[in-house]
């Protein structure tokens, strides 16, 4: 199955790396230091 992090979610994470948990079909973000929130957009 195609990884959505390389497609429609390519720019989803503002200050972090997109991560796809395939067995749950979940897109989430690993935030850079000091950032948080669903898209790592809060500091």
């Amino acid at each position: 199955k195609k990884n959505p992090c390389t497609a429609e979610f390519q720019n989803f994470c503002i200050h972090g790396e997109c991560r796809y948990i395939e067995h749950l079909e979940v897109v989430t973000c690993n935030c850079h230091q000091d950032y948080f929130g669903e898209r790592c957009g809060e500091k």
Partner: antibody, heavy 124, light 112 residues
Framework: EVQLVESGGGLVKPGGSLRLSCAAS????????MSWVRQAPEKGLEWVST????????YYPDSVKGRFTISRDNAKNSLYLQMNSLRAEDTAVYYC?????????????????WGQGTTVTVSS | DVVMTQSPLSLPVTLGDPASISCRSS???????????LHWYQQRPGQSPKLLIY???NRFDGVPDRFSGSGSGTDFTLKISRVEAEDVGVYYC?????????FGQGTKLEIK
């Protein structure tokens, strides 16, 4: 308000079938894996099934595998549990639960939202 | 399957006193990425379970800071620094590192 409301429980004879439903509101249902957990009378919690956000992947313990089927309709914000070949040991309160927030890369916060439960009684 | 073993199963506590619940798993709960998916739930009498602690030591939203979780690998602990009347209920540890997800038998906390 984030809410899960189960329905469909009742009294059924051994070998019978039942379909449970769970109506979700107050959050983006399609973004969350969902689970069913049951609790037999005066007993502890037992995980019954989990389904991925898009419904592609489903998981069951051996105790229900082949008899129970979890499904979801993201357009209707609804989760289902089809229960076939029911046994007396399936008698329990069945809870619908959201499989945790997915922020900060912590996709398994645990089951963070639970419904009030629906009672299933299997008896002749 | 991963077996979760809690002790004690019954815990009578005096109001204001500390309380501690142990949870042991039959195998390590650390996954390939180094994450440990061990959670604690509280179930008050007549209510649905509620998430208390996620991933060993993280308090869920709105959970008082008198609750704390600790541990690693196969050995985990839930502590209540000062028990209050509203803490009465059954506490379950649970793992979601391995399928099937499993729960401990539950520890019933009551006031002496």
């Amino acid at each position: 308000e984030v809410q899960l409301v189960e329905s469909g429980g009742g009294l059924v004879k051994p070998g019978g079938s039942l379909r449970l439903s769970c109506a979700a509101s107050g959050f983006t249902f399609s973004s969350y894996p969902m689970s069913w957990v049951r609790q037999a009378p005066e007993k502890g919690l037992e995980w019954v099934s989990t389904i991925s956000t898009g419904g592609t992947y489903t998981y069951y313990p051996d105790s229900v595998k082949g008899r129970f089927t979890i499904s979801r309709d993201n357009a209707k914000n609804s989760l289902y549990l089809q229960m076939n070949s029911l046994r007396a040991e399936d008698t329990a309160v069945y809870y619908c639960a959201r499989q945790g927030p997915i922020y900060y890369g912590n996709y398994y916060y645990g089951m963070d939202v639970w419904g009030q439960g629906t009672t299933v009684t299997v008896s002749s | 399957d991963v077996v979760m073993t809690q002790s004690p199963l019954s815990l009578p506590v005096t109001l204001g006193d500390p309380a501690s619940i142990s949870c042991r798993s039959s195998q390590s709960l650390v996954n390939q990425e180094g994450e440990t998916y061990l959670h604690w739930y509280q179930q008050r009498p007549g209510q649905s379970p509620k998430l208390l602690i996620y991933k060993v030591s993280n308090r869920f939203d709105g959970v008082p800071d008198r609750f704390s979780g600790s541990g690693s690998g196969t050995d985990f602990t839930l502590k209540i620094s000062r028990v209050e009347a509203e803490d009465v209920g059954v506490y379950y540890c649970s793992q979601s590192t391995h399928v099937p997800y499993t729960f401990g038998q539950g520890t019933k906390l009551e006031i002496k």
